[in-house]
Amino acid sequence: EINGSANYEMFIFHNGGVQILCKYPDIVQQFKMQLLKGGQILCDLTKTKGSGNTVSIKSLKFCHSQLSNNSVSFFLYNLDHSHANYYFCNLSIFDPPPFKVTLTGGYLHIYESQLCCQLK
């Protein structure tokens, strides 16, 4: 298992919500990405391929997510101060083998300016 801080901008704020960017290498074809808040699994997305190179995307813990060829974005809405925490992208790589797990993360700071519908 490889652990480390994300070496890219992991949190992108917009409209009172946050997009949490979880990157993976372009070469990865089949994987599971979990978003952890502290030690708790908030969201997950699994991409696998069939014999005809068809793709299956599944989630056991569903969040609004977006998949690209090198990242999974998870979206959290209605931010409040309770969202401040360490968030981790837990990537399990199935293909190419051998199986490996990488964990990258960072701390989500919540500032008044990023909250939804603040009172003026």
Partner: antibody, heavy 120, light 106 residues
Framework: EVQLVESGGGLVKPGGSLRLSCAAS????????MHWVRQAPGKGLEWVGV??????????YYSDLVKGRFTISRDDSKNTLYLQMNSLKTEDTAVYYC????????????WGQGTLVTVS | DIQMTQSPSSLSASVGDRVTITCQAS??????LSWYQQKPGKAPKLLIY???LLAEGVPSRFSGSGSGTDFTFTISSLQPEDIATYYC????????FGPGTKVDIK
């Protein structure tokens, strides 16, 4: 212990039909892609076709040599794979193996001992 | 369809010899190549997958290398129990086997 046991082989006339079965045990059958591979007497291995898992809507793919004549199906509740062979030709004479493969999260590959089909 | 070729079709070597078999794909298959061993009257056995990864329980004298279209399978020190036919198989797009290489002892 993993076991794949093929049955249903035998002697059949050209133009006839035969249904092979493959009973699986010792692994989670429903998670595996199931293939048929054949080997004519004294010859090399030849892929016949595959049926994917439920995640991929049980999609089937066939080699050009058998397309339109052979049909692969599976019954996950019975841990059984089938090969329906119609319009049989003398060149279909072979030992037929069922094989189970999976790549997620680890790569595994299991083979049965084969069943002989003679078209004569 | 992806075609696989293998050479040589057969070879004889002495116990302890280094044995090398080559396999070529008709198009780029990345590293999606397996090697199988088949002994007479038996089902094939997976030795190597994803070009160079040893299957469970396979001795380390077996190895594989290559990428794209050209691949090599090596037995570093041939043992009597290695007498068999060896097949490469691509699994980049469905499955295709090479024609096989029969290995025996001099």
């Amino acid at each position: 212990e993993v076991q794949l046991v093929e049955s249903g082989g035998g002697l059949v006339k050209p133009g006839g039909s035969l249904r092979l079965s493959c009973a699986a045990s010792g692994f989670t059958f429903s998670d595996y892609f199931m293939h048929w591979v054949r080997q004519a007497p004294g010859k090399g291995l030849e892929w016949v076709g595959v049926i994917d898992t439920k995640s991929f809507n049980y999609a089937t793919y066939y080699s050009d040599l058998v397309k339109g004549r052979f049909t692969i199906s599976r019954d996950d509740s019975k841990n059984t794979l089938y090969l329906q062979m119609n319009s049989l030709k003398t060149e279909d004479t072979a030992v037929y193996y069922c094989t189970a493969t999976i790549a997620v999260p680890y790569y595994f590959d299991y083979w049965g001992q084969g069943t002989l089909v003679t078209v004569s | 369809d992806i075609q696989m070729t293998q050479s040589p079709s057969s070879l004889s070597a002495s116990v302890g010899d280094r044995v090398t078999i080559t396999c070529q794909a008709s198009q780029d298959i990345s590293n999606y190549l397996s090697w199988y061993q088949q002994k007479p009257g038996k089902a094939p056995k997976l030795l190597i997958y994803y070009t160079n990864l040893l299957a469970e329980g396979v001795p380390s004298r077996f190895s594989g290398s290559g990428s794209g279209t050209d691949f090599t399978f090596t037995i570093s020190s041939l043992q009597p129990e290695d007498i068999a036919t060896y097949y490469c198989q691509q699994y980049y797009n469905y499955r295709t086997f090479g024609p096989g290489t029969k290995v025996d002892i001099k």
